[in-house]
């Protein structure tokens, strides 16, 4: 059985065919002698039944309402009545892009990371019967596939295989010619599994510094995006009005990971700021990473091997 | 509308044998490709295995191949996962989802969690070692 049109809302693609298909068909069968009647408003018109006579282009069948093909003026509102059920659809029929070999607005997008499986099946269940051939293009070139009936790409996804694949299926009704086009746009891009997050540098800096005057301590991180990057200092944080939490700046690697910098700035530095832990910390789901800095006195430096100093 | 019911999990020793079965309600059943998941205490949910719509392709996590075969029959409206040679890492709940249908192309993209629009309660295997 062919899967009813639940949608509500729906958008098509002038001059292809189209049905809708109402979901209470098994319904319908079981009660051969109700009345079924579809309706269509739109704008001017207040629920106009539709019938064979209505458009030559319309087809009627016990749970179906078929364009062949469907037009800009078919826009509007859709109704099917059998006894207390209604249905209803809104359609919207779009303009064809006449340049290309498929319709910019119809076109479903999908990002696929590199060396992730993917899979495109050109398979037309409902009109199976009607279709003579079928044809997958990427970026509008045809794909020369072995399989013409359903052509199938199956693959480990390469960044070459970026582009717009369309499906095309070639149909014969009452000796014309029509065809149906299904258009996937695939981005791929780096792989985007988590890593864990890292704190660059070493763990412990001793920073030398002066008395009276600024420092800014600098705290960078190799992180995931919705990781975080915080400083921790002193009994209660934000207690000391001279040492704020710079803005934190993040830039994209070519890897799709951020590095990230949040640099804490301590002003007219004291006596009580001297050996002290001001620690950093990148937290993420899978656990954290922190590293801490010292001030330490200029005048204190030679008791303190070289190798821990930062500027 | 699909609903789908998992059955078959349970409490085996490492190296025994289970077979997931997952029931979909719905008469479009053989539309959907199907997938299991699952999701072990404290961690994500990270993809097992999956089958397409036809029964044709089905691909596997790396940590299962070769262990676990996904099947479908589109007869009975059910997918199997038959889990062969245990491992106590295998303890987890798992789930059934089915993708989302469209006409006329697929695109199939079995690992991606995002891409299955109904799921499963969930049965719970525990591999004891």
């Known amino acids: 059985a062919e899967s009813c049109t639940s949608r509500p809302h729906i958008t098509v693609v002038e001059g292809e065919p189209f049905y809708l298909k109402h979901c209470s068909c098994s319904l319908a069968h079981e009660i051969e002698t109700t009345t079924k009647s579809w309706y269509k408003s739109s704008g001017s018109q207040e629920h106009v039944e539709l019938n064979p006579r209505s458009s030559s282009r319309i087809a009627l069948h016990d749970c179906v309402l078929e364009f062949w093909p469907v037009e800009l003026n078919d826009t509007g509102s859709y109704f099917f009545q059998m006894k207390n059920y209604t249905q209803k659809w809104k359609l919207n029929v779009i303009r064809r892009n006449k340049h290309s070999c498929f319709t910019e607005r119809q076109v479903t997008s999908k990002i696929v990371e590199v060396k992730k499986f993917f899979q495109i099946t050109c398979e037309n269940s409902y009109y199976q019967t009607l279709v003579n051939s079928t044809s997958l293009y990427k970026n509008c070139k045809k794909l020369l596939l072995e399989n013409n009936k359903n052509p199938t790409i199956k693959k480990n996804a390469e960044f070459e295989d970026q582009g717009y694949y369309s499906c095309v299926h070639f149909l014969h009704h009452n000796g014309k010619l029509f065809n149906i086009t299904k258009t996937f746009n695939i981005t791929i891009v780096e792989d985007r599994s988590n890593i864990v997050p890292v704190l660059l540098g070493p763990k412990l800096n001793h920073v030398a510094v002066e008395l009276g005057k600024n420092v800014r301590l600098n705290c960078s991180a190799l992180l995931n995006e919705e990781d975080v990057i915080y400083w921790m200092f002193g009994e209660e944080n934000g207690s000391d009005p001279n040492i704020h939490e710079e803005k934190e700046m993040r830039i994209m690697t070519p890897e799709g990971k951020w590095h990230a910098s949040k640099v804490l700035r301590i002003e007219n530095i004291g006596e009580s700021n001297l050996n002290v832990l001001y620690n950093c910390t990148v937290a993420s789901t899978g656990g954290t990473d922190t590293k801490s800095f010292i001030l330490v006195r200029k005048a204190d430096m030679a008791d303190i091997p070289g190798h821990v100093f930062t500027r | 509308q699909v609903q789908l019911v998992e059955s078959g999990g349970g409490l085996v020793q490492a190296g025994g044998s289970l077979r997931l079965s997952c029931a979909a309600s719905g008469r479009t059943f053989s539309k959907h490709a199907m997938g299991w998941f699952r999701q072990a205490p404290g961690k994500e949910r990270e993809f097992v295995a999956a089958?397409?719509?036809?029964?044709?392709?089905?691909y596997y996590a790396d940590s299962v191949k070769g262990r676990f075969t996904i099947s479908r029959d589109n007869a009975k409206n059910t997918v199997y996962l038959q889990m062969d040679s245990l491992k106590p890492e295998d303890t987890a709940v798992y789930y059934c989802?089915?993708?989302?249908?469209?006409?006329?192309?697929?695109?199939?993209?079995?690992?991606?969690?995002?891409?299955?629009?109904?799921w499963g309660q969930g049965t719970q295997v525990t591999v004891s070692s």
């Open positions: 089958i397409d719509w036809s029964g044709g392709s089905t």
């Open positions: 989802a089915a993708d989302s249908y469209t006409d006329y192309a697929q695109l199939w993209l079995p690992e991606l969690e995002s891409e299955y629009d109904y």
